[in-house]
Amino acid sequence: TLNSVLNSNAIKNLPPPLGGAAGHPGSAVSAAPGILYPGGNKYQTIDNYQPYPCAEDEECGTDEYCASPTRGGDAGVQICLACRKRRKRCMRHAMCCPGNYCKNGICVSSDQNHFRGEIEETITESFGNDHSTLDGYSRRTTLSSKMYHTKGQEGSVCLRSSDCASGLCCARHFWSKICKPVLKEGQVCTKHRRKGSHGLEIFQRCYCGEGLSCRIQKDHHQASNSSRLHTCQRH
């Protein structure tokens, strides 16, 4: 629950979010405090498709969501499933393909008047002082496709990594998701060794940048498993 995640003791002892983010290529956003907003990040091609086990939407690609493969199936067995296209049934926003959101159980186009809250704020913030908004909530009126495709800058609220500008990913921070920088060489990253091990983290870290992977720091090999420090290192 939100309460157990945010009040856990482990939260208080996390390293600071160097550069605002961290992670590894194996899962574009290192999963963290599973609090509120869904969105996919781990890209997979349709060709040669392998079911990818997941615990939440963040562990899947931008065109996928995390769910049980069979209706009413074992909730403990979840895989990344292809996103639902327009007019298909849905239960939450992450189930709908990019450019769509879930409204009244149906995936509808995001350029049809209503936007998911995070995308609304990203648009508002990207366009500066829109005096027709109040406290960062956009008017729920049609916005041009040009506006919709504006990428969120660092700190903007987002739904998926595709909402963020180049060099940023969409990652959780407390009760929200914001665009954070992709990690540079030497920065601390998070590597999860088992499904669901992210439950105690307070923020998500982005993946390591191009040509880098999240590996245990050489001088930490002797440390206990629980205290091993991972950093972004050259392949």
Partner: antibody, heavy 117, light 107 residues
Framework: EVQLLQSAAEVKRPGESLRISCKTS????????MHWVRQMPGKELEWMGV????????SYNQKFKGHVTISADKSSSTAYLQWSSLKASDAAMYYC??????????WGQGTLVTVSS | DIQMTQSPSSLSASVGDRVTITCRAS??????LNWYQQKPGKAPKLLIY???RLHSGVPSRFSGSGSGTDFTFTISSLQPEDIATYYC?????????FGQGTKLEIK
């Protein structure tokens, strides 16, 4: 237009129970988290806790945990802050704040709680 | 909890002056710093979030800078309506914590 309308000022005695409310309008209640912030007379702001109205999940500042309860009613788009037994030190202004980001964007006008014997 | 220390606790300036308020965190908070304005008897208003991003509808005379532990809030040209108490807030680590406030008055 996002609006957060808080309940009227309250005057209570120590040991009494109290529930104050924050009624929202102008946005989808379940899509934004609701926070409660305390401000004692002449003092700074203190974050008390947060609720996700979509599922009722809550998180509290350890300082307030066990002493207050945050809840939400989706049908009326209203959030609540309640005490089962007030203390004199609970006398303060209480604000609700609704947001999606790690900042507090929209605020209620505040509810002044006076506790005196 | 992370402690936020603002300075000065109060200051007096003239209309048109450049005003600077500083906020120091007890540990590194990266860019996770917000600034609020509170006028007497009113609720706080978000001015700046994520260290330097201007909130919607906020005049451009307000700005924020800094990183890590030391942050600065600036009003480039003080206006009469800017008389208020200003608070910094860290949102790097739970619980979010606020500075003690800086009361701004007109000379």
């Amino acid at each position: 237009e996002v609006q957060l309308l808080q309940s009227a000022a309250e005057v209570k005695r120590p040991g009494e129970s109290l529930r104050i409310s924050c009624k929202t309008s102008g946005y989808t209640f379940t899509e934004y988290t609701m926070h409660w912030v305390r401000q004692m007379p002449g003092k700074e702001l203190e974050w008390m806790g947060v609720i996700d109205p979509s599922n009722g999940d809550t998180s509290y500042n350890q300082k307030f945990k066990g002493h207050v309860t945050i809840s939400a009613d989706k049908s009326s788009s209203t959030a609540y802050l309640q005490w089962s037994s007030l203390k004199a030190s609970d006398a303060a202004m209480y604000y609700c704040s609704s947001t999606t980001g790690p900042w507090f964007a929209s605020w209620g006008q505040g509810t002044l709680v006076t506790v005196s014997s | 909890d992370i402690q936020m220390t603002q300075s000065p606790s109060s200051l007096s300036a003239s209309v048109g002056d450049r005003v600077t308020i500083t906020c120091r965190a007890s540990q590194d908070i990266s860019n996770y710093l917000n600034w609020y304005q509170q006028k007497p008897g009113k609720a706080p208003k978000l001015l700046i979030y994520y260290k330097s991003r201007l909130h919607s509808g906020v005049p451009s005379r307000f700005s924020g800078s800094g990183s890590g532990t030391d942050f600065t809030f600036t009003i480039s040209s003080l206006q009469p309506e800017d008389i208020a108490t200003y608070y910094c807030q860290q949102v790097h680590t739970l619980p979010p914590t606020f500075g003690q406030g800086t009361k701004l008055e007109i000379k």
